[in-house]
């Protein structure tokens, strides 16, 4: 029986060009975590496997850093990074737990300020 729960950072926002940590935490279970996937709906970002270590998708290699812990750090954010991110915990003997984080990447306040006070 799956007794665990996934706690996530929920809905988060960050500025364009900045970075953000995606973090999930599995609690209320003694199950062993054997692999954690970080995914979007249509592609995998990274995998942390207990035996194989970290794998980062080539599409994200330049701006994704593993950690802290089982989390994932996204760098050099663009507005295209806005969307859903999933952490999938593969555990033994429980099975699979999934958490969801929604990230909104905002135009930086500097960019907004500059645009607002542009000289015609």
């Amino acid at each position: 029986m799956m007794t665990g729960t996934i706690e996530t950072t929920g809905n988060i926002s960050a500025e364009k060009g900045g970075s953000i940590i995606l973090q999930c935490h599995l609690s209320s279970t003694t199950a062993q975590v054997t692999q954690v996937n970080w995914e979007q709906q249509d592609q995998l970002l990274a995998i942390c496997n207990a035996d194989l270590g970290w794998h980062i998708s080539p599409s994200f290699k330049d701006r994704v850093a593993p950690g802290p812990g089982l989390g994932l750090t996204l760098q050099s954010l663009t507005v295209n990074d806005t969307g859903e991110y999933f952490c999938i915990y593969h555990t033994y003997p429980d099975g699979t737990y999934t958490g969801r984080i929604f990230l909104e990447v905002l135009e930086s306040s500097v960019a907004e300020h500059g645009a607002r006070f542009q000289i015609p």
Epitope: N37, Q41, D42, N49, L52, S57, E84
Partner: antibody
Framework: QVQLQESGPGLVKPSETLSLTCAVS?????????WNWIRQPPGKGLEWIGY???????SYNPSLRSRVTISRDTSKNQFFLKLSSVTAADTAVYYC???????????WGQGTLVTVSS | DIQMTQSPSSLSASVGDRVTITCKAS??????VAWYQQKPGKAPKLLIY???YRYTGVPSRFSGSGSGTDFTFTISSLQPEDIATYYC?????????FGQGTKVEIK
């Protein structure tokens, strides 16, 4: 228990549009997951067509993108496939399936055979 | 697109035999590979996900292994009800792609 059921015409004429419906019971298509269409020509392998996610976003196979539209009716808990300008090569069993991130296609409909012929 | 190449395309084995099917991805997909069983006239069934994890209710005689580009699916002791076609599939990135299938028959 989640169930998916495909329906639609079994015969479509060349150059016309193939239209299929997937009726989902036991789970709301707006709650979670990606809701997919996959096809299998007779005696051949499986080809992913595309999906509509619970939030309404879509993703299509580039090989079919110019001809495919996947949409949904949330009030009826159904999603749809439209494939335009069909040819004999589109003759296949069409499946709808629910995909879970990290797992794959865990739930499938029973499939419906669509033949393209004049 | 990521190509998934399965071998053999068909095999014949006796009840109780160990059966092994391999799948090669055209690029590194880490452990993002699933395996399906399809019986004639039926929809595929998910057996293995993330290369080595058995899906709910799948008998322990079915197992998977591998990472990167090379993957293996094993039936430790073939049973009459295992007669089917088996497919690998990458769940690394869209478009999701399948191997061409391996038909398993009883000798």
């Amino acid at each position: 228990q989640v169930q998916l059921q495909e329906s639609g015409p079994g015969l479509v004429k060349p150059s016309e549009t193939l239209s299929l419906t997937c009726a989902v019971s036991g789970y709301s298509i707006t709650s979670d997951y990606a809701w997919n269409w996959i096809r299998q020509p007779p005696g051949k392998g499986l080809e992913w067509i595309g999906y509509i996610s619970y939030s309404g976003s879509t993703s299509y196979n580039p090989s079919l993108r110019s001809r495919v539209t996947i949409s949904r009716d949330t009030s009826k808990n159904q999603f749809f496939l439209k494939l335009s300008s069909v040819t004999a090569a589109d003759t296949a069993v069409y499946y709808c399936a629910r995909r879970q991130v990290g797992l794959g296609f865990a739930y499938w409909g029973q499939g419906t055979l669509v033949t393209v012929s004049s | 697109d990521i190509q998934m190449t399965q071998s053999p395309s068909s095999l014949s084995a006796s009840v109780g035999d160990r059966v092994t099917i391999t799948c090669k991805a055209s690029q590194d997909v880490s452990t993002a590979v699933a395996w399906y069983q399809q019986k004639p006239g039926k929809a595929p069934k998910l057996l293995i996900y993330s290369a080595s994890y058995r899906y709910t209710g799948v008998p322990s005689r079915f197992s998977g292994s591998g990472s990167g580009t090379d993957f293996t699916f094993t039936i430790s002791s073939l049973q009459p009800e295992d007669i089917a076609t088996y497919y690998c599939q990458q769940h690394y990135s869209t478009p999701w792609t399948f191997g061409q299938g391996t038909k398993v028959e009883i000798k």
